[in-house]
Interface confidence: low
């Protein structure tokens, strides 16, 4: 190579490759006819110099054009994040259709695809049991009501509490845990003032699951003096 | 640049950089004086052509030399994995000392450091309650005994069951869930044959947590006919 050619030295930088994640709809949205379930596609680690990413959505490999894509947002680490939500039909999810998000950009070496669908397998309805506070807890100001939800499949479930018919807020659900037979269980714990329990108020554990008749069941619990 | 210069195009390859992960000791090892808690450092994605990695360990920034480093092992993808375990003093972990693993190699652009320590905050002992099977479950062949462990901090906890003094196996623990006040709770569910429950066998929920006196407590449960 002649000396005056001016060939530039190679400077190789490690490319930051964006990651794509796909998220299922919320179980409650899938099982409540008045709500709209959505599959969500999130692209992270987008460089500020990258062009906008393009989202394409497919239901059982047929392209659909009903997604809502938000403008990308800057994150604290100076990268960007882009989100696209696809409203879906309740029955499409329940019937096991596949939802595919394809993400492309001039900055990507190839499109990135992520697919999601409902867990395969025959639905099994949960058994729901309400459990009053343990006797030893009655020495405290706050007591815990427990809802034990067992033997369900798949793991997608919604557990909520009502108190005298109104939504209760001070509850926490565990993540679904798999039993040895492949079914799942969950516990939900509602903390209430002991005085509210002893006053005989009714507390209701409400469960949404696709295996249930009408996708819904509930079990109530109240203090019976003398017990 | 003249046309006949013959400058070579730049071909950049993405370097495979090793990753380092650090893992805490098991809660049971930390809280059982006859066991040895260990902090573990794992290096993955080591190329077969790379020299051995060197591990250095520091406790509160003071170098220690008691680690056991295993010979590197080949993985299925033709990369290697190297593991170093540092046996630690129970009290050092409980007192919040920082454990640092530094990994270096002639193939690395710089040493890689990972640090771990116990979750900060004042320990709070769990409240442990055992709950018999719900009455409605007694129609089934198998019933569920529940251990509710509440209001503890930090989240590191071990929950096990014994049956007439022998370790039980058919139990599952939920992952610790944070209460609104920053403490944690866990449920453990032991499935037993109804006949074993009705026979009056004693089932014991055993809990190890640093906030407990002697780091241990247990609560027993058995069927009382007529209840």
């Amino acid at each position: 190579v002649p000396r005056d050619c001016g060939c530039k030295p190679c400077i190789c930088t490690v490319p930051e490759v964006s990651s794509v994640f796909i998220f299922p709809p919320k179980p409650k949205d899938v099982l409540t006819i008045t709500l709209t379930p959505k599959v969500t596609c999130v692209v992270v680690d987008i460089s500020k110099d990258d062009p906008e990413v393009q989202f394409s959505w497919f239901v059982d490999d047929v392209e659909v054009h009903t997604a809502q894509t938000q403008p990308r947002e800057e994150q604290f680490n100076s990268t960007f994040r882009s989100v696209s939500e696809l409203p879906i039909m309740h029955q499409d999810w329940l019937n096991g259709k596949e939802f595919k998000c394809r993400v492309n950009s001039a900055a990507f070496p190839a499109p990135i695809e992520k697919t999601i669908s409902k867990t395969k397998g025959r639905p099994k309805a949960p058994q729901v049991y309400t459990i009053p506070p343990p006797k030893e807890q009655m020495a405290k100001d706050k007591v815990s009501l427990t809802c034990m939800i067992t033997d369900f499949f798949p793991e997608d479930i919604t557990v909520e509490w009502q108190w005298n018919g109104q939504p209760a807020e001070n509850y926490k659900n565990t993540q679904p845990i798999m039993n040895t037979n492949g079914s799942y269980f969950v516990y939900s714990k509602l903390n209430v003032q002991k005085s509210n329990w002893e006053a005989g108020n009714t507390f209701t554990c409400s469960v949404l699951h696709e295996g249930l008749h009408n996708h819904h069941t509930e079990k109530s619990l109240s203090h019976s003096p003398g017990k | 640049v003249p046309r006949d210069c013959g400058c070579k195009p730049c071909i950049c390859t993405v370097p495979e950089v090793s990753s380092v992960f650090i893992f805490p000791p098991k809660p049971k090892d930390v809280l059982t004086i006859t066991l040895t808690p260990k902090v573990t450092c794992v290096v993955v994605d080591i190329s077969k052509d790379d020299p051995e990695v060197q591990f250095s360990w520091f406790v509160d920034d003071v170098e220690v030399h008691t680690a056991q480093t295993q010979p590197r092992e080949e993985q299925f993808n033709s990369t290697f994995r190297s593991v170093s375990e540092l046996p630690i003093m129970h009290q050092d972990w409980l007192n919040g000392k920082e454990f640092k693993c530094r990994v270096n190699s002639a193939a690395f652009p710089a040493p890689i450091e990972k640090t771990i320590s116990k979750t900060k905050g004042r320990p709070k002992a769990p409240q442990v309650y055992t709950i018999p099977p719900p009455k409605e479950q007694m129609a089934k062949d198998k019933v569920s005994l529940t251990c509710m462990i509440t209001d503890f901090f930090p989240e590191d906890i071990t929950v096990e069951w014994q049956w007439n003094g022998q370790p039980a196996e058919n139990y599952k623990n939920t992952q610790p869930i944070m209460n609104t006040n920053g403490s944690y709770f866990v449920y453990s569910k032991l499935n037993v044959q109804k006949s074993n429950w009705e026979a009056g066998n004693t089932f014991t929920c055993s809990v190890l947590h640093e906030g407990l006196h002697n780091h241990h407590t247990e609560k027993s449960l058995s069927h009382s006919p007529g209840k």
């Epitope: 994640f21 992520k114 | 049971k28 573990t40 994995r81 593991v83």
Partner: nanobody
């Protein structure tokens, strides 16, 4: 959402071998324990083997001990089940499952909450 995809199933003669693979995507594999489960026609799903996130501990069902070997390669986001000395009773759909690593010391493959769609293994002459 973590996704798992199994491969490597097929038809094999008794005494033969197969190696199943499970590719995990949508999450950091190092954060999960991996289990292999199987379901034979008309039977309940059963655990076959599992391995902790750092490959340090493994568990096997009694029926496969000494014949099956579980392993994982976090760098490749892949878990494996090497099945040797296969028997007709091993015929089933084999599922891979991921569980978040649990620091409780006595449970080596707890609480799977992500599943693959399964791969068929048939052992027949």
């Amino acid at each position: 959402q973590v996704q798992l995809v199994e491969s490597g199933g097929g038809l094999v003669q008794p005494g033969g071998s197969l190696r199943l693979s499970c590719v995990v995507s949508g999450g950091t594999m190092n954060a999960y324990a991996i289990g292999w489960f199987r379901q034979a026609p008309g039977k309940e799903r059963e655990a076959v083997s599992c391995i902790t996130s750092n490959s340090k501990y493994t568990n096997y069902a009694d029926s496969v001990k000494g014949r099956f070997t579980i392993s994982r390669d976090n760098a490749k986001s892949t878990a494996y089940l090497q099945m040797n000395s296969l028997e007709p009773e091993d015929t089933a759909v084999y599922y891979c499952a991921a569980a978040q690593f649990f620091n409780d010391g006595h449970q080596y493959c707890p609480n799977p909450n992500y599943w693959g769609q399964g791969t068929q293994v048939t052992v027949s002459s």
